[in-house]
């Protein structure tokens, strides 16, 4: 940092440059090909780097297609190395989900495949693992190419718009269960094609206006199957089908692996599908009150051709406090003869930590223990698992990489530590095919650096990226700088996080924002740089951003995790306005200036803390929020709320609500803000919010944006709202 | 190497059934579709219909249906057509096959099937 | 069904000679054509698939041609243990249909 005695007369960080994206950040996203090479993509050309000795050679030149006459969104080599899918015609459906168009290429002719393309509007396409077979969904339905040029066998024909999907997820199982559009998964050779077939028959709709165009005289109405929390869910089945015995004279036989027993007594999910060898497979199931799940491993038998999977090695996993998981049971990571796996789950005193399972055995042995948490197992090789925790110097908010050796767990290395520490303390990795090699990310304190190691022996090769051009662009501006510390609760650490406006001075009395989100396993203390809202508030505006980690929030233990099971909207929102209670004792917060903003699940927190009559915050911002749980869809909701009946949460249901606050609002000044499409948390909730506050004669201010999804991140929207925030949150400082 | 080995010709009556089976061997017998066709002298072949040994799934041809019934002993690893209520057209030769990817790829030598009083 | 209609339906000729057989489907068949062998003993094998591709194992003096309706199979160069019948069959719709087959023999 620059101390300047004298005034400072570098610029600030402004809104328009957070609009504009003026600083860039720059990433080095590389692609694993093999165990030793990585393709990364330069001025468009795409390169093939060794990992060992940097050098690289170009694997496709940015001219191939030039004559293409179309727009190439994204790339996928064939595992061999024979093929190029290109993807084009994007067209976005939610998070996840979206709709393409592909060619193939052929490397090795340098041509274009001109037969049997893959139809438009394709839902989902992926290679095997190995070779050139192909896989994908159109119109909810399976095919398989096990030749780019040759006609594709088809799988399902049982695929119906809305109602029957193969190999795709409905919209919730896309938003809460997989995080992912693809419900496929390809045998580590590619001889089974595994998947999911979702039915969504009973799934009640949500329905909403598109207004599209102004010449669009009726506007269109859009139709989700999506089931709130206690309604009809949609079922899931389970097959496998041999890729390798397809005719075109036959259809596909795909056989069912059916859930076990224990789940079918009643409502269930599929809530992960994991390929332990070529011939054993993994799946997990969780009951829709999803504190009990159980996974299968089940087994080829050629004489029967069916798929067993005996009871003696299934795993129960359940939570007595809470939920399992932290948003959903963790994967297995299966040894290489798949008789033993490594799971994360939670131990004894709560804390997710890595447990070793062998098939046959009820019980595991964990090989990492403390009052810290394992956030992801990265690789697995015959002497070493690699895991990211937030160990080190006990701060939650860290993420490091170690290696611990598997024949001797009192043997762990922290490969990340101490390479930089002033500079990073976030990272993440991305290991090459057998981990030979691996890219450390660092995300924090300082600027990003991608740099390469080699696991033989951990040494770093080479920086891949310093960010060294940004940091010579922001030594000429004024940038804040963050503070991650905690204070004390009952006994209990909880971590905060402020951005400081340049040049902080303690002796002074600066406005307050708290950023919130502080939903279950949430975290917003961390040690993460980031070029944000937040940057230009604190560094033009002088505003400290503040955020705090109470109850609820992840990855410092279950006491913390499950404090709020059963309960949303009380303790993660009281711990939040006892956050801003400390912070304002903080000597440098004017407490006449406190205010509080959040999106979604920060929606629904910042909108019943303004509505919990503290008097501690004078105005507050609540986007998209939640704002009565039987609004939100089952899978989240019933994880932490249970149902909505009166044998089991109902009268929790109805007392977190926002509009029953609605008395309390004529102490603040609100703004409320929610996109017309928001397939997530639909704009009914923000509706009711609304409604309820024009009953009792509540003045606030609001904003709509019409066809805005959840995100609200169209280029005119984006710069819109963040514009009109900046103007309620100046005038409610009293800032020019 | 894969074999697919039919039984013997058969000799029988109008109105009668004949069962002919068909012993698969040098692969995997659940993992492969069978398929059966039929061919009179001078005319073209025609498909019965097929049978998934390790799920027991069967597509019959429409025209077959009542006619063909395709079952499968897994233990044995043989597949079999039973042709019911037979007439003088059903006389013919009558073959299962392989089908993988886009050809029948294995076939069996055949069976003479004669119907006549 | 579809219905395969092959030409001729016996062909003499004479070892060394490059003979073509066709065949006509009474629709559109995409390419989705393959030919078959049957020898003098019964056997029936693959030769060609997906109108032009060659099945693995069989000789290179045989292949394939054609698109949407009409077709066509060719020797380059006729051995003895290619006179055979020899069979269309398409596989783009279902039931998969066969031509009557055309009889390859010595002049």
């Known amino acids: 940092h620059h101390h300047h005695h004298h005034a400072d007369s570098r610029k600030t960080y402004t809104l328009t440059d957070y609009l504009k994206n003026t600083y860039r950040l720059k990433l080095y996203s590389l692609r694993w090909i093999s165990d030793h090479e990585y393709l990364y993509k330069q001025e468009n050309n795409i390169l093939v780097f060794n990992a060992e000795y940097g050098n690289s050679s170009v694997f496709l030149e940015n001219s191939t297609f030039d004559e293409f006459g179309h727009s190439i969104n994204d790339y996928s080599i064939s595992p061999d190395g024979q093929f190029i899918l290109l993807e084009y015609n994007y067209v976005k459906q939610w998070r996840h989900s979206y709709t393409a168009s592909y060619d193939i290429y052929d490397l090795n002719k340098r041509q274009l495949i001109t037969e049997e393309r893959i139809p438009n509007n394709t839902q989902w396409v992926t290679w095997s693992p190995v070779g050139h077979k192909l896989a994908y969904v159109w119109n909810n339905d399976i095919y398989v190419k096990i030749e780019p040029n040759l006609p594709s066998y088809r799988i399902t024909w049982t695929g119906k718009e809305d109602i029957i999907y193969n190999g795709i997820t409905d919209w919730v199982y896309e938003e809460e269960v997989f995080s992912a559009y693809s419900a496929l998964w390809w045998s580590p050779n590619g001889t089974f094609l595994a998947y999911a077939q979702f039915n969504d028959t009973e799934v009640p709709l949500i329905e909403y206006s598109f207004y599209s165009d102004e010449s669009l005289q009726y506007p269109k109405t859009v139709r989700v199957p999506y089931p709130k929390a206690g309604a009809v869910n949609p079922t899931v089945k389970f097959f496998v089908v041999n890729t390798d015995s397809l005719s075109s004279v036959t259809n596909a036989t795909s056989i069912q692996i059916t859930a076990p027993a224990s789940m079918l007594i009643g409502d269930h999910y599929l809530c992960d599908v994991t390929w332990a060898t070529q011939e054993r497979i993994s799946l997990q199931w969780l009951r829709r009150i999803q504190n009990y799940s159980v996974m299968d491993i089940c087994d080829y038998d050629e004489s029967s051709g069916r798929w067993n999977c005996l009871v003696a090695r299934q795993h129960i996993e359940m939570s007595t406090t809470g939920w399992v998981g932290r948003f959903r049971p963790s994967e297995p990571h299966f040894t290489l003869d798949g008789n033993s796996f490594y799971k994360i789950i939670s131990n004894e005193e709560g804390y997710r930590h890595i447990c070793y399972f062998q098939i046959d055995k009820k019980d595991c042995t964990f090989i990492t223990k403390g009052t810290w948490e394992v956030i992801g197992i990265e690789a697995l090789t015959s002497d070493y698992l690699y895991y990211i925790s937030n160990e080190y110097k006990g701060m939650p908010g860290g993420r490091n990489l170690y290696k611990i050796q598997l024949s001797d767990y009192t043997k762990v290395t922290c490969l990340s530590c101490e390479l930089n520490p002033e500079r990073c303390q976030y990272y993440s990795v991305s290991f090459s095919k057998e981990a030979k090699y691996y890219q450390l990310r660092c995300s924090g304190p300082g600027l990003p650096l991608y740099t390469l190691h080699s696991s033989v022996n951990d040494k770093g090769l080479r920086v891949l990226e310093d960010n060294s051009a940004l940091d010579k662009m922001l030594q000429n501006v004024q940038m804040p700088s963050k503070k991650l510390d905690f204070i004390i609760l009952n006994e209990t650490k909880f971590w905060y996080q402020m951005i400081l406006p340049p040049h902080f001075d303690k002796s002074k009395k600066y406005p307050l924002l708290l950023d919130v989100y502080a939903g279950p396993c949430s975290q917003k203390a961390d040690t993460v740089f980031r070029l944000n809202w937040a940057t230009y508030l604190a560094s033009t505006e002088n505003i400290i951003v503040a955020s705090f980690d109470g109850r609820g929030s992840g990855y410092q233990g279950d006491k913390i995790m499950h404090a709020i099971n059963r309960r949303l909207g009380t303790f993660e929102v009281e711990d939040q306005i006892e956050a801003a209670r400390q912070f304002s004792k903080m000597g440098f917060v004017d407490n006449k200036r406190i205010a509080i903003w959040g999106w979604s699940y920060g929606g629904y927190v910042t909108s019943m803390v303004l509505g919990s009559g503290s008097g501690v915050f004078k105005c507050g911002i609540a986007v998209a929020p939640v704002s009565r749980w039987e609004y939100y869809d089952s899978v989240y909701t019933e994880r932490y709320m249970g149902l909505p009946t009166p044998e089991d949460n109902l009268d929790h249901y109805r007392n977190s609500t926002v509009m029953s606050r609605a008395e309390n609002f004529k102490q603040v000044e609100y703004l409320l803000i929610h996109g017309t499409a928001d397939d997530n948390v639909h704009f009914q909730q923000s509706a009711q919010i609304s409604k309820a506050l024009v009953d009792v004669g509540v003045d606030f201010q609001a904003m709509w944006y019409t066809d805005e999804d959840h995100g609200i991140a169209s280029s005119t929207a984006h710069q819109h709202i963040y514009t009109h925030m900046s103007h309620f949150i100046k005038q409610c400082f009293s800032l020019p | 190497e894969v074999q697919l080995q039919q039984s013997g010709a058969e000799l029988t009556k109008p109105g009668s059934s004949v069962k002919i089976s068909c012993k698969a061997s040098?692969?995997?017998?659940?993992?492969?579709?069978i398929g059966w066709l039929k061919q009179r002298p001078g005319q073209a072949l025609e498909w019965i219909g097929y049978i998934n040994p390790g799920s027991g799934g069967i597509g019959y041809n429409e025209k077959f249906k009542g006619k063909a019934t395709l079952t499968v002993d897994k233990s044995s690893s043989t597949a079999f057509m039973q042709l019911s209520s037979l007439t003088p057209e059903d006389t013919a030769v009558y073959y299962c096959?392989?089908?993988?990817?886009?050809?029948?790829?294995?076939w069996g030598q055949g069976v003479m099937v004669t119907v006549s009083s | 069904d579809i219905v395969m209609t092959q030409s001729p339906s016996s062909l003499p000729a004479s070892l060394g000679e490059r003979v073509t057989i066709s065949c006509r489907a009474s629709q559109g068949i995409s390419n989705k054509l393959n030919w078959y062998q049957q020898k003098p003993d019964g056997t029936i094998k693959p030769l060609i698939y997906?109108?032009?591709r060659l099945q693995s194992g069989v000789p290179s003096r045989f292949s394939g041609s054609g698109s949407g309706t009409d077709y066509s199979l060719t020797i380059s160069s006729l051995e003895p243990e290619d006179f055979a019948m020899y069979y269309c069959q398409q596989d783009a719709s279902f039931p998969p249909t066969f031509g009557a087959g055309t009889k390859v023999e010595l002049k």
């Open positions: 040098g692969f995997t017998f659940t993992t492969y579709d």
């Open positions: 997906y109108t032009s």
């Open positions: 096959a392989r089908p993988l990817r886009r050809v029948l790829d294995y």
